[in-house]
């Protein structure tokens, strides 16, 4: 409408009792430059005078300024363009509405601002992202609607109390589209920040506490387990039972399922917090954990290495090598599977203890005929002696002996 | 669903013994932490104790510690509430809850997602 004059500014502005308030304002007159300018306080037209009644906060005429009793009320424009107004300190009583009455040489305007001014500081408002996962970086942000030239603050960001350690990064908004003290803090959280409290404080230029915001934060992780086993070295012998036991520290949200796991693999059947294993054999010996799933994801817990410990089994002999030349070296292997491994060894050729040897390798640096035959070996742990395997044959090859002729 | 029932209240003299259950349907219940809590007339919910799945972890309120004992039995689905040396302080209205969060939030009434109706428990001198 080309009959109305233009302003900008921002609907509502929002201080506290001895702070100040700072306007930003622009404007265009519909016809030449501003004559008179008077900023009233709740301002209602008196139809029988066609004049505005109301409190004067500011009274400025074509021949100068009006004294004014309201030092604190600053008019900061000019006379076409900005109608920018700061009040400094600003009064609870200043609430309502500030009339904006402007006259040029044939026209006037009276433009209307609202102000909201609380008896005590109102607190800031923590703005979190819809979702928070572990570990997943997040800006919080705390927004405070307020800013003035001359009344400095700041936001203070604090986690259960304690200020936190990241930077936060401070900015403000003095326009006449909107006015007001920002902070933002990029923070990376962990699932133990799960029902912790954040706070952002609004403090004065000195940090002396003027009011808080805080939220508890719902940080969604998968399941943190711990897992406990009987015996705690997790060693036992064959035909010994175990039981593993696995507990969920934290879950967020609700966990729905359980397994165990054994080297990595499912195993069937197994779906509470606890694994009995009865009369375990060998080959139960393995790395075990939990795995507890929510709609994040699956939690494992730490993995427990299962030992199961057993007598050696029957002995197997390797030769390097057979045959062997007169002359040349060979050695002998004794192999026997074994938890702990066997601590001594015997010796067998051609069915005959062989003296002096009870190492897991015998050395024969030179072969003579006669060792050729069959070696076989016992191997022997802390829980008993192996049998003894089918052995393994040594074929000595020689040149012609005692050569006769016929 | 899950769905929990108490029962083993009733009165008591002071000095006494009651021994609360909390039988569970579905097979979920042994795979929840349980918990049991009480109200007063005219005071809060108060958290009295919780055990982990597995029986392995176990929580009392400083209130109720070394009288009262909470066990399981998840081949029956039920929790227990063995409660000794009961006292005036003690008469309330005892419900048991499943919570599936973790150990952390035992004695935390909201995290708990269901609720039996609860037994009353009363306490005469």
């Known amino acids: 409408d080309s009959s109305k004059w233009v302003f900008e500014h921002p609907e509502t502005l929002y201080a506290w009792e001895g702070a100040c308030v700072w306007i930003p304002c622009t404007y265009r007159a519909l016809d030449g430059d501003l004559e008179s300018f008077i900023l009233f306080h709740n301002p209602e037209y008196n139809k029988n005078t066609s004049k505005f009644d109301g409190t004067r906060l500011y009274e400025s005429t074509k021949d100068g300024k009006v004294p004014s009793e309201q030092k604190r009320v600053q008019f900061l424009g000019d006379k076409n363009k900005n109608c920018t107004l700061s009040i400094h300190p600003v009064h609870l009583n200043d609430s309502g509405q500030l009339g904006l009455r402007m006259e040029s040489k044939t026209e006037k305007w009276m433009e209307r601002i609202h102000l909201n001014v609380s008896e005590r500081p109102f607190p800031p408002h923590i703005q979190l992202p819809p979702e928070i996962q572990e570990s997943q970086e997040v800006t919080l942000t705390c927004l405070l609607n307020f800013s003035c030239y001359g009344y400095p603050i700041q936001l203070q960001w604090l986690l259960e109390g304690v200020p936190m350690r990241q930077a936060a990064v401070t900015s403000t908004s003095l326009t006449i589209k909107s006015v007001f003290t920002r902070s933002e803090l990029k923070f990376s959280p962990q699932w133990s920040h799960h029902g912790k409290i954040v706070t952002c404080q609004l403090q004065d230029a000195d940090g002396k506490f003027l009011s808080n915001d805080t939220v508890q934060l719902n940080v969604k992780h998968t399941p943190k387990l711990e897992i406990k086993v009987t015996p705690s070295d997790a060693i036992v012998r064959e035909g010994d039972s175990v039981t593993m036991t696995c507990e969920v520290s934290s879950s967020n949200p609700e966990y729905t399922t359980v397994s165990w796991l054994k080297d990595g693999t499912s195993l069937k059947k197994q779906n509470t917090f606890t694994l009995n294993l009865r009369e375990v054999t060998k080959d139960q010996s393995g790395k075990y954990c939990c795995q507890v799933s929510n709609d994040v994801g699956p939690g494992r817990s730490e993995e427990v290495f299962l030992q199961v410990q057993y007598a050696p089994e029957p002995s197997t002999v390797q030769i390097l090598h057979s045959p062997a030349v007169e002359g040349s070296q060979v050695e002998f292997l004794c192999m026997s599977l074994a938890n702990p491994l066997p601590t001594n060894y015997t010796w067998y050729h051609n069915g005959k203890e062989m003296q002096g040897r009870t190492e897991e390798k015998v050395h024969i640096p030179k072969i003579l005929p006669w060792h050729a035959g069959t070696y076989s070996c016992v191997a022997e742990n802390i829980l008993g002696t192996g049998q003894r395997g089918p052995g393994a044959e040594l074929d000595v090859q020689y040149p012609p002996k005692k050569v006769t002729t016929v | 669903q899950l769905q929990l029932v108490e029962s083993g209240g009733g009165l008591v003299q002071a000095g006494g013994s009651l021994r609360l259950s909390c039988v569970g349907s579905?097979?979920?219940?042994?795979?929840?932490?349980m918990g049991w809590f009480r109200q007063a007339p005219g005071k809060e919910r108060e958290f009295v104790a919780a055990i982990s799945p597995s029986g392995g972890r176990i929580t009392y309120s400083d209130s109720v510690k070394g009288r009262f004992t909470i066990s399981r039995d998840n081949a029956k689905n039920t929790v227990y509430l063995q409660m000794n040396s009961l006292k005036r302080d003690d008469t309330a209205v005892y419900v048991c809850?499943?919570?599936?969060?973790?150990?952390?939030?035992?004695?935390?009434?909201?995290?708990?997602?269901?609720w039996g109706q609860g037994t009353q428990v009363t306490v005469s001198s």
């Open positions: 579905g097979d979920r219940v042994s795979i929840a932490l």
């Open positions: 809850a499943a919570n599936f969060r973790g150990y952390l939030s035992s004695s935390r009434g909201s995290d708990y997602a269901y």
